[in-house]
Structures are given as C-alpha cells and as structure tokens.
Interface confidence: low
C-alpha cells in the first residue's frame, strides 16, 4: 500500500529538526524507546507525541532556550514550531486519544528525534516497497 502523506510530512519535519542544534536540544526527555518491546506502533507514536508535547509546553518560553542573541531566538522558535507540527502529525498517525508515559529512562531531545527519525524511515521503506 502507499505511504501515508502524514508519514512523509513527519520525516520531512524530523529532517529539519535534526539538521541544527539549539540551546535546548541537549535537554532530556522521557526515553519511550528504551523499553518498547510490548508496545504497538500506534502506542509508540502516541507516546512520542506526548513526550514532545510535554517538552514544548515546558520549554516554549524558557529563556535558557530562547537565548540572548537574535539567532538563538530564531532557532528556538523554529524548533518549537517544528515540534508542534510533529506532535500534530504523530497524533494523526496514532489515532489514539491518550497514552501513558511512565518510563524513568531519559534521553536528550536530539537523540530522541534521531531515534524517531530512524523508526519513521524504516516504516517508510516498508510501505513504499
């Protein structure tokens, strides 16, 4: 079957997100991928969206992330905009209302996004072949 247009949009957004670091991509988020053996794909997407929503809700106005220079400010605002887009698309792909995120493990946002990108690319390669 053909790949969902949402999946293509997610990969495109993840590519943009992982291209440049900001002051806050080194901050930690819940690592939902650490122990996801008994988790369905939809649950994984839902939980990833939840983690991203928690991150941007908490750090959108964080002055440590906004930085002191105009360039740092632009980059953080762009990061938040991309995270919101990613959150919205992941919810669409998951089709679930809510999902628990209880893991204790942490990972940097940067690593979290790289891992998510790998998963999405794998999914894309399967659905496009």
């Amino acid at each position: 079957h053909k790949c969902d247009i949402t999946l293509q949009e997610i990969i495109k957004t993840l590519n943009s997100l992982t291209e440049q670091k900001t002051l806050c991509t080194e901050l930690t988020v819940t690592d939902i991928f650490a122990a996801s053996k008994n988790t369905t794909e939809k649950e994984t997407f839902c939980r990833a969206a939840t983690v991203l929503r928690q991150f941007y809700s908490h750090h959108e106005k964080d002055t440590r992330c906004l930085g002191a220079t105009a360039q740092q400010f632009h980059r953080h605002k762009q990061l938040i905009r991309f995270l919101k887009r990613l959150d919205r698309n992941l919810w669409g792909l998951a089709g679930l209302n809510s999902c628990p995120v209880k893991e204790a493990n942490q990972s940097t946002l940067e690593n979290f996004l790289e891992r998510l990108k790998t998963i999405m690319r794998e999914k894309y390669s399967k659905c496009s072949s």
Partner: nanobody
Framework: EVQLLESGGGLVQPGGSLRLSCAAS????????MGWVRQAPGKGLEWVSW????????YYADSVKGRFTISRDNSKNTLYLQMNSLRAEDTAVYYC?????????WGQGTLVTVSS
C-alpha cells in the same frame, strides 16, 4: 513593499521610561508575529521581545523581563514597546522586526540612550 518605521527613541535618565512605536505597512500586519531586537554600540544583535499574531502570549529576554512590555494594535498596524526602569545597559539602537524564522524585515531603528 514592506515598511517598518520606528519612533520614540531618545535620551533618558536611568530609571526613566520610553515608549517605542513601530508603524507597519505593505503587509497584513495581523497575520504576522512581530518583535523588537536591539544592538548596543560595538555589540551583536540581541532579541528583546516578541509577540505572536494573536498577541495572547508575549516573550521577553531575561535582561528586560519585568521592565519592558510589548503590545500591538492590529487596527492601527502598530507595534509598541513600553520601556520602564531603564538602565545604562539598555542603550542601543532598537529595531522593529517582522516574523521570526528568521526576522525577514527590519526597520531602520531608533536610538535609545540611557545616561545621566
């Protein structure tokens, strides 16, 4: 053609106040986030404050938080920056800017000098 015209700068004593205005034209003002950026003599650009399209949220750099207030009047296509409790380190050229990724249009700037 997009135009941003700042006004309201000048010389003020420490602890004093100023209100900067930015008259915008050439684009649909209410559809864009707007901000203030400043450049102190011999230094790089520093973002000061930001207000999104709807104006419900406002953002401030730590250095001005609690002293500066950004606002906008979409009916007048005008952006404002109320600056209170001014300090010598606030001395800079203040620029009004449109959009944030990156700021794609700038005004000519207005000079604010804080000195006794």
């Amino acid at each position: 053609e997009v135009q941003l015209l700042e006004s309201g700068g000048g010389l003020v004593q420490p602890g004093g106040s100023l209100r900067l205005s930015c008259a915008a034209s050439g684009f649909t003002f209410e559809e864009y986030g707007m901000g203030w950026v400043r450049q102190a003599p011999g230094k790089g650009l520093e973002w000061v404050s930001w207000i999104p399209e709807g104006g419900r949220r406002t953002y401030y750099a730590d250095s001005v938080k609690g002293r500066f207030t950004i606002s906008r009047d979409n009916s007048k296509n005008t952006l404002y920056l109320q600056m209170n409790s001014l300090r010598a380190e606030d001395t800079a050229v203040y620029y009004c800017a449109k959009n944030y990724s990156p700021f794609d249009y700038w005004g000519q700037g207005t000079l604010v000098t804080v000195s006794s």
